[in-house]
């Protein structure tokens, strides 16, 4: 009685169960009553990441530097190449097919979360008592200078974009 289902890592062909090719190898010929499945290793810059009966290996992903991409992890015969973005850039999608420049936080805003290869900068407004006077992808909001601790007084209040201006006590009105 010919089988209707095969074990794991096998496939049904011509009413018989053949072994699948292991990851990193492609199918050359199916097994017969007398021969095993014939598999061949994938070539340079190719891969197959599952037990398979593919007759062609997949091409490794190309990390195109013109799109701001670079290799994060080189592919093997069993794994695809993983791309990431150049410093200062991040992926536009999970597949990381292209990159865009990290956003900078404008004056009055600080960095809440620094960008990574896969996520953009997250900015937050500087609350009262803090400021940022630069456009930056790294700088957090800075606290206003405490004039009191320097034995000075506030001559001009700070804003979300400027620090407090301190002055000597005798300038107090």
């Amino acid at each position: 009685e010919p089988p209707t289902a095969c074990r794991e890592k096998q496939y049904l062909i011509n009413s018989q169960c053949c072994s699948l090719c292991q990851p990193g190898q492609k199918l050359v010929s199916d097994c017969t009553e007398f021969t095993e499945t014939e598999c061949l290793p994938c070539g340079e810059s190719e891969f197959l990441d599952t037990w398979n009966r593919e007759t062609h290996c997949h091409q490794h992903k190309y990390c195109d530097p013109n799109l701001g991409l670079r290799v994060q992890q080189k592919g093997t015969s069993e794994t695809d190449t993983i791309c990431t973005c150049e410093e200062g850039w991040h992926c536009t999608s999970e597949a990381c097919e292209s990159c865009v420049l990290h956003r900078s936080c404008s004056p009055g805003f600080g960095v809440k979360q620094i960008a990574t290869g896969v996520s953009d900068t997250i900015c937050e407004p500087c609350p009262v008592g803090f400021f940022s006077n630069v456009s930056s992808a790294f700088e957090k909001c800075h606290p206003w200078t405490s004039c009191e601790t320097k034995d000075l007084v506030v001559q001009q209040a700070g804003t979300n974009k400027t620090d407090v201006v301190c002055g000597p006590q005798d300038r107090l009105r």
């Epitope: 008592g129 009191e148 506030v154 009105r173």
Partner: antibody, heavy 122, light 113 residues
Framework: QVQLVQSGAEVKKPGSSVKVSCKAT????????IEWIRQAPGQGLEWIGS????????NYNEKFKGKATFTADTSTSTAYMELSSLRSEDTAVYYC???????????????WGQGTLVTVSS | DIQMTQSPSSVSASVGDRVTITCRSS????????????LAWYQQKPGKAPKLLIY???TLESGVPSRFSGSGSGTDFTLTISSLQPEDFATYYC?????????FGQGTKVEIK
Amino acid sequence: QVQLVQSGAEVKKPGSSVKVSCKATGYTFSTSWIEWIRQAPGQGLEWIGSILPGSGSTNYNEKFKGKATFTADTSTSTAYMELSSLRSEDTAVYYCARGDDGSYVRWYFDHWGQGTLVTVSS
Amino acid sequence: DIQMTQSPSSVSASVGDRVTITCRSSQSLLFSVNQKNYLAWYQQKPGKAPKLLIYWASTLESGVPSRFSGSGSGTDFTLTISSLQPEDFATYYCQHYYSYPWTFGQGTKVEIK
């Protein structure tokens, strides 16, 4: 203890001005913000702006720019708010309150004056 | 400007009841650097000045009874009175102090049922 005492109620004609005072005691007046808040009859609270008496630095709610002017006299620990070109819509209780004390962590209003009722009526 | 929205606008309750007032801001009031929420709650009785109850969203002002508590983070905040007392019938306001201009919620009146 901290106390803010405001000037008495005023009745004013439309188009005139009024100056409300707020005398502070019990803390360092020059280094603490004085906040000004208004409450129209039966309405909620609205922030007008603030002044840091020692430096004269001010912050105004855009809505009240040109309407309110803040000054302070550190020799008498008194803050003032002048309201100009009065209209009937300016009828409200005006409060002063203490804001941050220079520590940059006390921006909430922990002490309030008793309020000054300004009535604008012809 | 940051908008503050309170609900409900009024609530009828009896002495001993648990009362919850919510306040929502149009922008997060949580600052990542100090992990503080820039929100205060005030109580106002008729003809009187408001009184500070809670600041930094959950810190009880000195002298305020422990039946008052504040919670929440980011954009959603709650003031809870665990067991309403006769002196608690008043109007309650939330206020942010994140950035100028400071703004208040429209108020919640707690009335006797």
